[in-house]
Interface confidence: medium
């Protein structure tokens, strides 16, 4: 049987949730972001590419859970190996993906 | 809003198999898996099994597997339990719920389908 | 198969009177416990989530403790409405259970 998720992660779930069911206006004003390859090393790639989004208060507590989660210094600009090259995506998309593919790591093992 | 909109009552012999409907409206279907939870006459709840309708992935309560199977149709955001070799001891309120990830609560219910088993 | 037992089976009160019901795991579920409230020829209605987690529109006077195996659901002060039957959740593993129920009844 599947065991929940840390309180840590269950968190950062519970955030992403209320940041794709609260949203009204466009998220951090239409900003683009670096489509990432969701397969390995997720939160590290999620928080390199999020993190080049300032000003957004929105995402803030998100980009500070994913920090929490990567064991490494992240800092803006850098570039992940895991970023699908040329491929900008908006940060409400980014959001969303990155939910549902934290579901469906929850869901593996529980459902047949 | 949320509403979950379940068939209606139904009277089986026994041996049977009844096929009950759960029609989604209000979210986005695939968002979220759909339980089903039973409620014999003046007994507790009852948990079947749920299904996430993304996938079509299952899981079942020991209890009714072989017996059980949810299925869904994303294409009218609906989903279906089917309980076959109906005994009189299936006589129960069906409710079909929504979870987004089954440690969260069932935060919308179905109104309930009574299926009566009875010769 | 994680057993929930709730206590106590009934509860008779009067309107005003705090209600306190329990619910006991028969392993540790952390915070994986959420509450529901029926009446009769009604579906459950989702009161508590993540045992003392509030949801919006549910009246403040309804209120979750505990983690772990012990459980407590608190209806500060009993109004005509609340006279109904409690059941606690696991959402902790598979399968799913849910306690037997409190019945909160008229004195």
């Known amino acids: 049987s599947p065991v929940p998720p840390s309180t840590a992660l269950k968190e950062l779930i519970e955030e992403l949730v209320n940041i794709t069911q609260n949203q009204k206006a466009p998220l951090c004003n239409g900003s683009m972001v670096w489509s990432i390859n969701l397969t390995a090393g997720v939160y590290c790639a999620a928080l390199e590419s999020l993190i080049n989004v300032s000003g957004c208060s929105a995402i803030e507590k998100t980009q500070r859970m994913l920090n929490g989660f990567c064991p490494h210094k992240v800092s803006a600009g850098q570039f992940s190996s895991l970023r699908v090259r040329d491929t900008k995506i908006e940060v409400a998309q980014f959001v969303k993906d990155l939910l549902v593919h934290l579901k469906k790591l929850f869901r593996e093992g529980q459902f047949n | 809003q949320v509403q979950l909109v379940q068939s209606g009552a139904d009277v089986k012999k026994p041996g049977a198999s009844v096929k009950v409907s759960c029609k989604a409206s209000g979210y986005t279907f695939i968002d979220y898996e759909i339980h089903w939870v039973r409620q014999a006459p003046g007994q507790g709840l009852e948990w079947m099994g749920a299904?996430?309708?993304?996938?079509?992935?299952?899981a079942y309560n020991q209890k009714f597997k072989g017996r059980v199977t949810m299925t869904t149709d994303t294409s009218t955001s609906t989903a279906y339990m089917e309980l076959r070799s109906l005994r009189s001891d299936d006589t129960a309120v069906y409710y079909c719920?929504?979870?987004?990830?089954?440690?969260?609560?069932?935060?919308?219910w179905g109104q309930g389908t009574l299926v009566t088993v009875s010769s | 198969e994680i057993v929930l037992t709730q206590s106590p089976a009934t509860l008779s009160l009067s309107p005003g009177e705090r209600a306190t019901l329990s619910c006991r795991a028969s392993?540790?579920?952390?915070?994986?416990l959420h509450w529901y409230q029926q009446k009769p020829g009604q579906a459950p209605r989702l009161l508590i989530y993540y045992a003392s987690q509030s949801i919006s529109g549910i009246p403040a006077r309804f209120s979750g403790s505990g983690s772990g195996t012990d459980f407590t659901l608190t209806i500060s002060s009993l109004e005509p409405e609340d006279f109904a039957v409690y059941y606690c959740?696991?959402?902790?593993?598979?399968?799913?259970?849910f306690g037997g129920g409190t019945k909160v009844e008229i004195k």
């Open positions: 392993q540790n579920i952390s915070d994986y």
């Open positions: 959740q696991n959402g902790h593993s598979f399968p799913l259970t």
């Open positions: 719920t929504r979870i987004l990830l089954y440690y969260y609560p069932m935060d919308y």
């Open positions: 299904i996430d309708p993304e996938t079509g992935g299952t």
